[in-house]
C-alpha cells in the first residue's frame, strides 16, 4: 500500500505567440482545479477507460479575474498535494493523466460551469520511494509544471511497496506507555509466520512459530504488560541515557481517525491512512467519493455540498447516467428526416439519406426532374423523393435509355405474330382472329361480332397497334 503524490507548481500560458492571456478572459471570474488519474501499464488505453490505479481531485484554487492591462501571470493554484492512495503493489509503469479544469463563477444559469482547459497524458516509469520527479508539459497553448512521486505506507517498503518491515533489533528499553525518542531503523523482508495468537502489537518473530515480546510485554503470546521498566523513576520528561520519552499528549492520542483509519504523527499534526471505502481528513466519510474516479467517459466529478450528498458526475456530450456510464442513444430522437438512416459515430451524428434527399439531416428534397433525367422523349414524374420516367414508345428502363423490344412480352393473342415497328408493334393475326392484339375471334359465317373493320383493313390483315 502507498500513496502517489502530485504537486502542481504552475499552470499558465505557454511561451510563444498566440498563447491565451488567461482562462477567464471576457468570461468574468473563474478558478482552477486539477484532476489526476492513474492507469496501470504503458499501453495506450482508451480515454474513457477507468482510472484503475486511482484518481483524485484538487481543491478549488483562488478566484482569478483577468486584469486587462496586466501581463499574463501564472494562475493562482489550489493549495496542497493531490494524493492518490493505492492499496496493492505499485506497478512501476503507469499512465499519468492530469486535467486542468476551469470553473466559471459569473452569473451562470444553473450554477457554476465547468470546462476542461488542458489535459496532459504521459506514460511513465517510476519506482516507489524515489525522489520527486519534475516535469513540464504543454497542452495546446498552456504549460503545466509539476512534480510527482510514489511512496509506500509502512509497513510496506520497496520499489513496489510489496515488502514488509519489521524492527531489526529490540525496539528500545522503554517500558509500557513510553515511546522511543528516535525512529527505528527498519530491516525489510517477508515476515515469518509467528505462533498462532502472538500479539500483533507487542510481539514479533524471527523464526516461524515463535513469539518474542517487545520490551514491556511478556507471556507466551506477549499480551501481559511488565510492571517495571528501565525508564521508570525518571523525574524529568526525558532521558538521554535510556533514550526514552514520557509521552506528552501526541496528536494521535485518542485515535482521531474514524472507521479503523491508522494515525501517524506529522510535524505538529497527524495524518490518517484510511481503509478502502473511507475518506476525509479523519476517514469519517463513507462510501464512494471523487477520489475513486467514479465518473467514466471523461465525466467531471464534483463532491456534493452537504455531508451526505453523493458526488455528482458532470457528463461530456454523448454520455449520461449517474456515473456517465451510459452512451446517449442520440439516434433514438430520430434526427434524420425523410426516412434517412441515423449513424452515431460517437464524436458526431451522421445521416445516410434515401435517394432524392440531402442535407445533414436529409431535410432537403431534391428536384430529380430538374436535370432532365428522362431520355428519348420520356417525361419525368416526380413523387415521394424519387423520380419516375414515363417513356416514349420503344424505350424503357429507369431513365428511358434502354431500347425496348415491344414484342418481348408476346402481346399478340391466339398465335398472332408480332412485328416490331418504328413506333410500336404490329400483330399479324392467325386466321379467324382480328383486332390490334388479335384478341377478337371472327365468326364462321363471316359476320363479325365487331363493328366493320376500318376502311382499308380486311379481317386477317396485320393490325397495327396504335
Amino acid at each position: 500500500a502507498g500513496v502517489f503524490e502530485l504537486q502542481i507548481h504552475s499552470f499558465g500560458p505557454g511561451p510563444g505567440p498566440g498563447a491565451p492571456r488567461s482562462p477567464c478572459s471576457a468570461r468574468g471570474p473563474c478558478r482552477l482545479f486539477f484532476r489526476v488519474c492513474l492507469k496501470p501499464g504503458l499501453s495506450e488505453e482508451a480515454a474513457e477507460s477507468p482510472c484503475a490505479l486511482g484518481a483524485a481531485l484538487s481543491a478549488r484554487g483562488p478566484v482569478y479575474t483577468e486584469q486587462p492591462e496586466a501581463p499574463a501571470p501564472d494562475l493562482p493554484l489550489p493549495n496542497g498535494l493531490l494524493q492518490v492512495p493505492f492499496r496493492d503493489a505499485w506497478p512501476g509503469t503507469f499512465s499519468l493523466i492530469i486535467e486542468t479544469w476551469r470553473e466559471e463563477l459569473g452569473d451562470q444559469i444553473g450554477g457554476p460551469a465547468w470546462s476542461l482547459l488542458a489535459r496532459v497524458t504521459r506514460r511513465r516509469r517510476l519506482a516507489a520511494g524515489g525522489p520527486w520527479a519534475r516535469d513540464i508539459q504543454r497542452a495546446g497553448a498552456w504549460e503545466l509544471r509539476f512534480s510527482y512521486r510514489a511512496r509506500c505506507e509502512l509497513p510496506a517498503v520497496g520499489t513496489a511497496c510489496t515488502r514488509l518491515c519489521r524492527p531489526r533489533s529490540a525496539p528500545s528499553r522503554c517500558g509500557p506507555g513510553l515511546r522511543p525518542c528516535a525512529p527505528l531503523e527498519d530491516e525489510c523482508e517477508a515476515p515469518p509466520v509467528c505462533r498462532a495468537g502472538c500479539s500483533l502489537e507487542h510481539g514479533f518473530c524471527e523464526q516461524p512459530g515463535e513469539c518474542r515480546c517487545l520490551e514491556g510485554w511478556t507471556g507466551p503470546l506477549c499480551m501481559v504488560p511488565v510492571s517495571t521498566s528501565s525508564c521508570l523513576g525518571l523525574r524529568g520528561p526525558s532521558s538521554t541515557t535510556t533514550g526514552c520519552l514520557v509521552p506528552g499528549p501526541g496528536p494521535c492520542d485518542g485515535n482521531p481517525c474514524a472507521n479503523g483509519g491508522s494515525c501517524s504523527e506529522t510535524p505538529g499534526s497527524f495524518e490518517c491512512t484510511c481503509p478502502r471505502g473511507f475518506y476525509g481528513l479523519r476517514c469519517e466519510v463513507s462510501g464512494v467519493t471523487c477520489a475513486d474516479g467514479p465518473c467514466f467517459n471523461g465525466g467531471l466529478c464534483v463532491g456534493g455540498a452537504d455531508p451526505d450528498s453523493a458526488y455528482i458526475c458532470h457528463c461530456p456530450p454523448g454520455f449520461q447516467g449517474s456515473n456517465c456510464e451510459k452512451r446517449v442513444d442520440r439516434c433514438s430522437l430520430q434526427p434524420c428526416r425523410n426516412g434517412g438512416l441515423c449513424l452515431d459515430l460517437g464524436h458526431a451524428l451522421r445521416c445516410r439519406c434515401r435517394a432524392g434527399f440531402a442535407g445533414p439531416r436529409c431535410e432537403h428534397d431534391l428536384d430529380d426532374c430538374a436535370g432532365r433525367a428522362c431520355a428519348n422523349g420520356g417525361t419525368c414524374v416526380e413523387g415521394g423523393g424519387a423520380h419516375r420516367c414515363s417513356c416514349a414508345l420503344g424505350f424503357g428502363g429507369r431513365n428511358c435509355r434502354e431500347r425496348a423490344d415491344p414484342c418481348a412480352a408476346r402481346p399478340c393473342a391466339h398465335g398472332g405474330r408480332c412485328y416490331a415497328h418504328f413506333s410500336g408493334l404490329v400483330c399479324a393475326c392467325a386466321p379467324g382472329y382480328m383486332g390490334a392484339r388479335c384478341e377478337f375471334p371472327v365468326h364462321p359465317d363471316g359476320v363479325s361480332a365487331l363493328p366493320a373493320a376500318p376502311p382499308g383493313l380486311r379481317p386477317g390483315d396485320p393490325q397495327r397497334y396504335l
Partner: antibody, heavy 118, light 107 residues
Framework: QVQLQQPGAELVKPGTSVKLSCEAS????????MQWVRQRPGQGLEWIGM????????NYNENFQTKATLTVDKSSSTAYMQLSSLTSEDSAVYYC???????????WGQGTSVTVSS | DIQMTQTTSSLSVSLGDRVTINCSAS??????LNWYQQKPDGTVKLLIY???NLHSGVPSRFSGSGSGTDYSLTISNLEPEDIATYYC?????????FGGGTKLEIK
C-alpha cells in the same frame, strides 16, 4: 425516497443455509456501504459486517466471519447475506441498513425474522 | 473490540419529561458516535450522528453531546411517539459495536 426492502420471515432447518436479500431503491446503490445487523430475541443490536457494492470491499465482525457472507447484485440493486451452518443460536431478526456519507446508518430495512427449527 | 455500555437498560418516564440516556465507551472514540431509536414494532431510525448532529427529519427535542468516552442523548420534552429503545453505536474502528440499549417505559 430511499427504501430498503427485506422479506418478512424465513423458516429454515438446522445445518442448512439461508440467503437473505435487501433490495435498495431511491439512491445510487453502488456508492454507499450496506450494513447488516443482527438482533436476537429480547437482545440488543450486533454489527455483522458491511459491503461497498462499487468495488465489493467487505468488512466483517470477526464473530461473524465464518457465519455470514455478504454479496451484491448491482444490476438489481440488491444486497445479500448468506448465513451458513444454521443453529437455533442464529434465530434472530437481521436488518440491512445503508451507511450514510457521515458514517451513520441512515436508512434501515424492516428486518427479516429468521427462525431455525427442525 | 470497543465495548459500549448503556448502564440503564430501562427507564420509567412520564410524558413531558426531560430524559437523558448515557453511553460510555471502553476507550476514547473521538466523538465517532451515533444514536438510534427502535420502536416496539422493530423499526429502526437514525437520530443523531457524530455525537451531536441531528439527522434530517428528526425533531429538535432530541440532542446529543459528549466527548472522549462519555456520551449522552437528551429528549427535552418526551412525546408519546418517543417511547422506544435507544442504542448508541461507535464507528471509531472495526468492529462497530452498539450499546445494550435503553428502553423507555411509561410510569
Amino acid at each position: 425516497q430511499v427504501q430498503l426492502q427485506q422479506p418478512g420471515a424465513e423458516l429454515v432447518k438446522p445445518g442448512t443455509s439461508v440467503k437473505l436479500s435487501c433490495e435498495a431503491s431511491g439512491y445510487t446503490f453502488s456508492n454507499y456501504w450496506m450494513q447488516w445487523v443482527r438482533q436476537r430475541p429480547g437482545q440488543g443490536l450486533e454489527w455483522i459486517g458491511m459491503i461497498l457494492p462499487n468495488s465489493d470491499i467487505t468488512n466483517y465482525n470477526e464473530n461473524f466471519q465464518t457465519k455470514a457472507t455478504l454479496t451484491v447484485d448491482k444490476s438489481s440493486s440488491t444486497a445479500y447475506m448468506q448465513l451458513s451452518s444454521l443453529t437455533s443460536e442464529d434465530s434472530a431478526v437481521y436488518y440491512c441498513a445503508r451507511q450514510a456519507r457521515y458514517s451513520a446508518m441512515d436508512y434501515w430495512g424492516q428486518g427479516t425474522s429468521v427462525t431455525v427449527s427442525s | 473490540d470497543i465495548q459500549m455500555t448503556q448502564t440503564t437498560s430501562s427507564l420509567s418516564v412520564s410524558l413531558g419529561d426531560r430524559v437523558t440516556i448515557n453511553c460510555s465507551a471502553s476507550q476514547g472514540i473521538s466523538n465517532y458516535l451515533n444514536w438510534y431509536q427502535q420502536k416496539p414494532d422493530g423499526t429502526v431510525k437514525l437520530l443523531i450522528y457524530y455525537t451531536s448532529n441531528l439527522h434530517s427529519g428528526v425533531p429538535s427535542r432530541f440532542s446529543g453531546s459528549g466527548s472522549g468516552t462519555d456520551y449522552s442523548l437528551t429528549i427535552s420534552n418526551l412525546e408519546p411517539e418517543d417511547i422506544a429503545t435507544y442504542y448508541c453505536q461507535h464507528y471509531s474502528k472495526f468492529p462497530y459495536t452498539f450499546g445494550g440499549g435503553t428502553k423507555l417505559e411509561i410510569k
